[in-house]
Interface confidence: medium
């Protein structure tokens, strides 16, 4: 399986909400001994590999933001903790999973990573991740709504 990031860059005005999205692609093993652990974290574009370093998002760790289920089942994080920080991560039945960040500030700018770990409980882990950049802008040059740039090209889309 693979993880696709529909958008590689999100440019948003301060105070706006944004939903960062990843998609789980390919065949998904639904065996009883397979678990999919999905989560989000901040990172940096490391010299060795992007997304290798896991930093908290608004003080919430990858463990706090994880989604647990088998295959393409829907799930969401512990609401109370995340929502106190203006965050919510969720997934649907089609392999899409996302994190919504509310009331963006300049401090939210940076690289965000979604991580999927396929855990075969008596053998190994297989992990894949996707990376996307969030730029929060303020002032006269800031867009009125979030603008997203697809990963495959630099055509932008306005989202409200």
């Amino acid at each position: 399986f693979k993880v696709a990031t529909p958008y590689s860059l999100y440019v948003c005005p301060e105070g706006q909400n944004v939903t960062l999205t990843c998609r789980l692609l390919g065949p998904v093993d639904k065996g009883h001994d397979v678990t999919f652990y999905k989560t989000w974290y901040r990172s940096s574009r490391g010299e060795v590999q992007t997304c290798s370093e896991a930093r908290p998002i608004r003080n919430l760790t990858a463990a706090d933001l994880h989604l647990h289920h088998g295959g393409h089942q829907a799930a969401n994080t512990s609401h109370d903790l995340a929502q106190r920080h203006g965050l919510e991560s969720a997934s649907d039945h089609h392999g899409n999973f996302s994190i919504t960040m509310r009331n963006l500030t300049l401090l939210d700018s940076g690289l965000y990573c979604c991580l999927v770990v396929e855990i075969r409980h008596h053998h190994s882990e297989h992990r894949v991740h996707g990376a996307m950049e969030l730029q929060v802008q303020t002032g006269k040059d800031a867009p009125s709504n979030c603008v997203v740039y697809p990963s495959s090209s630099q055509d932008s889309e306005n989202i409200t």
Epitope: D33, T35, Y37, T39, V48, Q49, S52, E53, A54, T61, A62, A63, D64, H66, H68, S78, L81, L115, V117, I119, H121, H122, H123, S124, E125, R127
Partner: antibody, heavy 117, light 107 residues
């Protein structure tokens, strides 16, 4: 910050079952995988096995026939049972938390278990 | 089972010196390798995960490198509190395994 505390008898007789409990505080038991790791006196570390809050388990094959790890989400606890113990099972037993794909980032302080008659 | 071999078994150095610890895997673990520090009577403490990433709160004098089968933990300038036993651990396959440890002692 998540904290872990092991508890259980410090002395177990040969052929009996060693039972330990790890209590999780300061975080959700559903956020991590939970492992048991042991360290015989003066020796290195050995991973025993893990459990997830859903009940999924994975054990070290060298101990699998004797190990059971269980979880009680209502008490935020997970437990280790090791049957038919011998003197070779004398060790400090640690519980640890583990975010899949990363590493054991939080450990209990450890509890010494001596197997002796 | 993946076997991790650490060398040297003991490293005798003085404060301020550079320490270089090695961990070799019996088969490739990609970069799925962690390093821990353990002091007498204490639980291990995570230093490095994924071969080269420092865990939260770990000083910059600790650095990790390598991939595949050969890994190195470097302590650029030893502080008195760094004298301890260091373990590597792989998590690409189960069972999860640790190296036998390297003791860094005061010369």
């Amino acid at each position: 910050q998540v904290q872990l505390q092991e508890s259980g008898p410090g002395l177990v007789k040969p052929s009996e079952t060693l039972s330990l409990t790890c209590t999780v505080s300061g975080g959700s038991i559903s956020s991590y995988y939970w492992s048991w790791i042991r360290q015989p006196p003066g020796k290195g570390l050995e991973w025993i096995g893990y459990i997830y809050y859903s009940g999924s388990t994975n054990y070290n094959p060298s101990l699998k026939s004797r190990v059971t790890i269980s979880v009680d989400t209502s008490k935020s606890q997970f437990s280790l049972k090791l049957s038919s113990v011998t003197a070779a099972d004398t060790a400090v037993y640690y519980c640890a938390s583990d975010i899949p794909a990363f590493a054991f980032d939080i450990w209990g302080q450890g509890t010494m278990v001596i197997v002796s008659s | 089972e993946i076997v991790l071999t650490q060398s040297p078994a003991t490293l005798s150095l003085s404060p301020g010196e550079r320490a270089t610890l090695s961990c070799r895997a019996s088969q490739s673990v990609s970069y799925y390798l962690a390093w821990y520090q353990q002091k007498p009577g204490q639980a291990p403490r995570l230093l490095i995960y994924d071969a080269f990433n420092r865990a939260t709160g770990i000083p910059a004098r600790f650095s990790g490198s390598g991939s595949g089968t050969d890994f190195t933990l470097t302590i650029s300038s030893l502080e008195p509190e760094d004298f301890a036993v260091y373990y590597c651990q792989q998590r690409i396959n189960w069972p999860l395994t640790f190296g036998g440890g390297t003791k860094v002692e005061i010369k």
